[in-house]
Interface confidence: low
């Protein structure tokens, strides 16, 4: 169960119900008091692990992981360091459901850094945990070359110059 702004959301056998039967969104309070919305449907995809994971203040919990959305902007490397200093890492997206959750929590016009860059050593797009990107799930728009880092905007992943300053997402 997840209580969010007075609405009790229940996840039962993959379907959702709440007292008001809205096709509306639940709310979670995250950084700076900002309320970011996620759909009840997405919440119901949460694994049981989500019930036990405790996220730090100002972090948003989803599917057993904790997420922090920045309001300021930094380069990719500065964002990377920022997350590490907080015992987390830049966002690693595992599937389209997670992408949908992230997108629900971003302004549609913003580019946001994620934990994916083009490494000259491997000559491939690599997540910050060292794993390669699954090209069957994600397509990166733009050049695959040295000093390219990935940012998301409107459910798409873009190749951007790593020195550009964008918002970012930390995850643990």
């Amino acid at each position: 169960l997840l209580v969010s702004q007075g609405v009790l959301l229940k996840c039962q056998k993959g379907s959702c119900s709440n007292a008001t039967q809205y096709e509306d969104t639940g709310d979670l309070k995250v950084n700076n008091g900002t309320r970011r919305n996620i759909s009840n449907k997405d919440l119901c995809a949460s694994r049981s692990a989500d019930q036990t994971v405790l996220c730090q203040s100002e972090w948003l919990k989803y599917q057993g992981k904790c997420y922090w959305f920045s309001n300021e902007m930094k380069s990719w490397s500065d964002s990377y360091v920022y997350c590490l200093e907080r015992k987390s890492h830049l966002l690693i997206i595992h599937d389209q459901l997670e992408m949908a959750f992230i997108q629900k929590n971003l302004r549609q016009l913003n580019y946001v850094w994620i934990g994916l860059n083009f490494t000259s050593l491997k000559m491939t797009w690599t997540w910050v945990d060292g794993s390669p990107i699954d090209s069957k799930i994600f397509f990166i728009k733009g050049p695959a070359k040295e000093n390219s880092c990935a940012a998301i905007k409107e459910s798409k992943i873009f190749s951007e110059t790593c020195s550009s300053v964008f918002k970012w997402i930390c995850q643990y």
């Epitope: 509306d24 309320r35 919305n37 302004r107 549609q108 016009l109 964008f166």
Partner: antibody, heavy 114, light 113 residues
Framework: SLEESGGRLVTPGTPLTLTCTAS????????MSWVRQAPGKGLEWIGI?????ATYYASWAKGRFTISKTSTTVDLKISSPTTEDTATYFC??????????????WGQGTLVTV | AQVLTQTASSVSAAVGGTVTISCQSS????????LGWYQQKPGQPPKLLIY???KLASGVPSRFSGSGSGTQFTLTISGVQCDDAATYYC?????????????FGGGTEVVVK
């Protein structure tokens, strides 16, 4: 705060540029919008320039208006004004603590008469 | 292009009464609830009251409330005060990648008796 300037009486077809001067915050961190209001009429959204400089226009405004910005100003160019462009023009800043694009800070507006 | 329709151009209410203003969108707003409400008084810029359909903007009295999802939205003023006499606009956000990002409704004037 936001302050619009450049509004005046112009003849039809004479290009006009309106300027919105921002103080107390950085335009590189906020999406900005232009909205107009004809005398006695409702609000009409013209377009947005996002924090990175990308522009988005209302379908009716494409080709007629151009939004650009510097570090401290946001400009709205009316390429060829017609009498229907007579209105008060407002610039507005996104509300920083909301998820959706709503406009929490507005200038007082500048009047354009064509 | 999307259209936001505020059916009543003017509504009246007695002091202490309740007024309801509706806003209907020709298509669902972004994320189902990305709709805002503004108050505008003559000679002044608009003031943000409600965002994301039901959330009160900072400094706005609690007598203002919003509801709705998808295409149907409502602004309610409970315990109307003389100071609430103004024109109220809804504003919907839509996907910027395909259509107009923002659209305003035509406005509803609230007259307080």
């Amino acid at each position: 705060s936001l302050e619009e300037s450049g509004g005046r009486l112009v003849t039809p077809g004479t290009p006009l540029t309106l300027t919105c001067t921002a103080s107390g915050f950085s335009l590189s961190s906020y999406d900005m919008s232009w909205v107009r209001q004809a005398p006695g009429k409702g609000l009409e959204w013209i377009g947005i320039i996002d924090n990175g400089g990308a522009t988005y226009y209302a379908s009716w405004a494409k080709g007629r208006f151009t939004i650009s910005k510097t570090s401290t100003t946001v400009d709205l160019k009316i390429s060829s004004p017609t009498t229907e462009d007579t209105a008060t023009y407002f610039c507005a800043r996104e509300n920083p603590t909301t998820h959706s694009l709503v406009w929490g800070l507005w200038g007082q507006g500048t009047l354009v008469t064509v | 292009a999307q259209v936001l329709t505020q059916t009543a151009s003017s509504v009246s209410a007695a002091v202490g009464g309740t007024v309801t203003i509706s806003c209907q969108s020709s298509q669902s707003v972004y994320n189902y609830n990305w709709l805002g409400w503004y108050q505008q008084k003559p000679g002044q810029p608009p003031k943000l009251l409600i965002y994301e359909a039901s959330k009160l903007a900072s400094g706005v009295p609690s007598r203002f409330s919003g509801s709705g999802s998808g295409t149907q939205f409502t602004l309610t003023i409970s315990g109307v005060q003389c100071d609430d006499a103004a024109t109220y606009y809804c504003q919907g956000e839509f996907s910027c990648s395909s259509v107009d990002c923002n659209v305003f409704g035509g406005g509803t004037e609230v007259v307080v008796k």
